[in-house]
């Protein structure tokens, strides 16, 4: 946030940039949390825009029995590995075809025993406040589907009739990692020393990191004709004086008519 300065007072302004603001020759360049001519004001909203998508990674092991292990399969650049990867990917795409969050598989290692396939199942979902539940459900469906296929697609008399066959007992889920996104935590961190006063409110399932000085939210502070200003002790209303009234009170809701205070002296002017 920047505020431009014109005229003779600019040199004075340069030395007076506050809150870590820096002078660029024309104006104070303010850090994210501040704005104003001297970076003296605290912003009332902080952009913590969530990622568009949240990812999860499941580390799985399955044992493929319809391919015999050869040493070339250890080499990821070999033709053997590439052909295995192609078939395995196609097979898994069929297995997980009903899961909207499924993105694909990534083979990390092939080892002996027929072919033990260490791989990651990659999941992704659009960010919503319920993303954890969505991904938790998807990981459960992945477990169900891989268990089912490795039970059903098995060798009979050393022959496989499917694209791939598996050892029923060789299926294991090692680990599940979900990308963590915590808007409340991000909001607190980005608000720094004002963190106690900033909160997350949702609008159209999007999180907004706001202080009570941001209008239009349930926590918004109504300063009436005054101005809401954030300080280290919290949001405060700075009340205004008009030609006819002084305003006071915590929310500037108490107006005193100047003519009542000045009385008849006011009329002699």
């Amino acid at each position: 946030r920047t505020t431009t300065c014109f005229g003779d007072g600019c040199q004075n302004t340069a030395s007076r940039c506050k809150n870590g603001g820096t002078w660029d020759g024309l104006k104070c360049q303010c850090p994210n949390l501040y704005y104003g001519e001297l970076c003296e004001e605290v912003v009332s909203s902080i952009d913590i825009g969530p990622p568009e998508t949240i990812s999860a990674q499941m580390e799985l092991t399955v044992t493929v029995t319809s391919v015999k292990f050869t040493e070339e399969l250890k080499n990821h650049s070999s033709q053997e590995f590439q052909e295995f990867k192609q078939t395995f990917t196609e097979q898994m795409n069929i297995v997980y075809s009903g899961i909207p969050e499924y993105v694909g598989v990534n083979i990390t290692k092939l080892r002996l025993g027929s072919v033990v396939v260490e791989h990651d199942v990659l999941l992704r979902t659009k960010y919503t406040p319920e993303y954890k539940t969505v991904l938790d459900n998807a990981t459960e469906v992945v477990k169900e589907k891989i268990t089912k296929v490795t039970t059903q697609q098995i060798m009979i008399n050393d022959i496989c009739s499917d694209m791939m066959c598996f050892n029923t007992t060789g299926t294991q889920v090692q680990n599940i990692t979900v990308t963590q996104y915590d808007p409340e935590e991000d909001c607190r961190k980005m608000a720094k020393e004002y963190g106690d006063y900033f909160v997350v409110e949702y609008r159209d399932q999007k999180p907004y990191c706001i202080s009570p000085c941001e209008p239009g939210f349930s926590v918004s502070k109504n300063c009436n004709l005054g101005k809401c200003q954030m300080s280290l002790s919290g949001p405060q209303c700075l009340c205004v004086t008009t030609e006819t009234h002084w305003y006071s009170g915590e929310t500037c809701n108490q107006g005193t008519q100047k003519s009542l205070v000045y009385g008849h002296h006011h009329h002699h002017h």
Epitope: V67, K68, T70, E72, Q79, F84, E90, S161, D162
Partner: nanobody, 123 residues
Framework: EVQLVESGGGVVQPGGSLRLSCAAS????????WGWFRQRPGKEREAVAL???????FYADSVKGRFTISQDNSKNTLYLQMNSLRAEDTAMYYC?????????????????WGQGTQVTVSS
């Protein structure tokens, strides 16, 4: 990239014989798996005879004792000797290959395919 070219198809009377050949380009012939598949009109492609570099072979029940799969590594060629041919053997015959040592009859597991050669058994 493996290139496969079949030959040897034709029209033969029931009880007759044919020998199909599949010439492969590339240096992968001595490893992996090789096979013959066929597709009859209106049917799915099916495994007829398969062979792997570890010596494993497979024959479909309907051709056991009549068909023989073999390969000549020096010529990079796969063969299918077909004897006692029947009308139900009429089909397009395809050569297939994979550098993997496979144990599957499913065509989707096989990566390299020829264009096919037609075999018609008719009197």
């Amino acid at each position: 990239e493996v290139q496969l070219v079949e030959s040897g198809g034709g029209v033969v009377q029931p009880g007759g014989s044919l020998r199909l050949s599949c010439a492969a380009s590339g240096d992968t012939f001595s490893r992996g798996s090789w096979g013959w598949f066929r597709q009859r009109p209106g049917k799915e492609r099916e495994a007829v005879a398969l062979i792997s570099s570890d010596g494993w072979t497979f024959y479909a029940d309907s051709v056991k004792g009549r068909f023989t799969i073999s390969q000549d590594n020096s010529k990079n060629t796969l063969y299918l000797q077909m004897n006692s041919l029947r009308a139900e053997d009429t089909a397009m015959y395809y050569c297939a290959a994979s550098v993997l040592v496979l144990r599957t009859l499913n065509p989707k597991a096989w990566h390299h395919w020829g264009q096919g050669t037609q075999v018609t058994v008719s009197s």
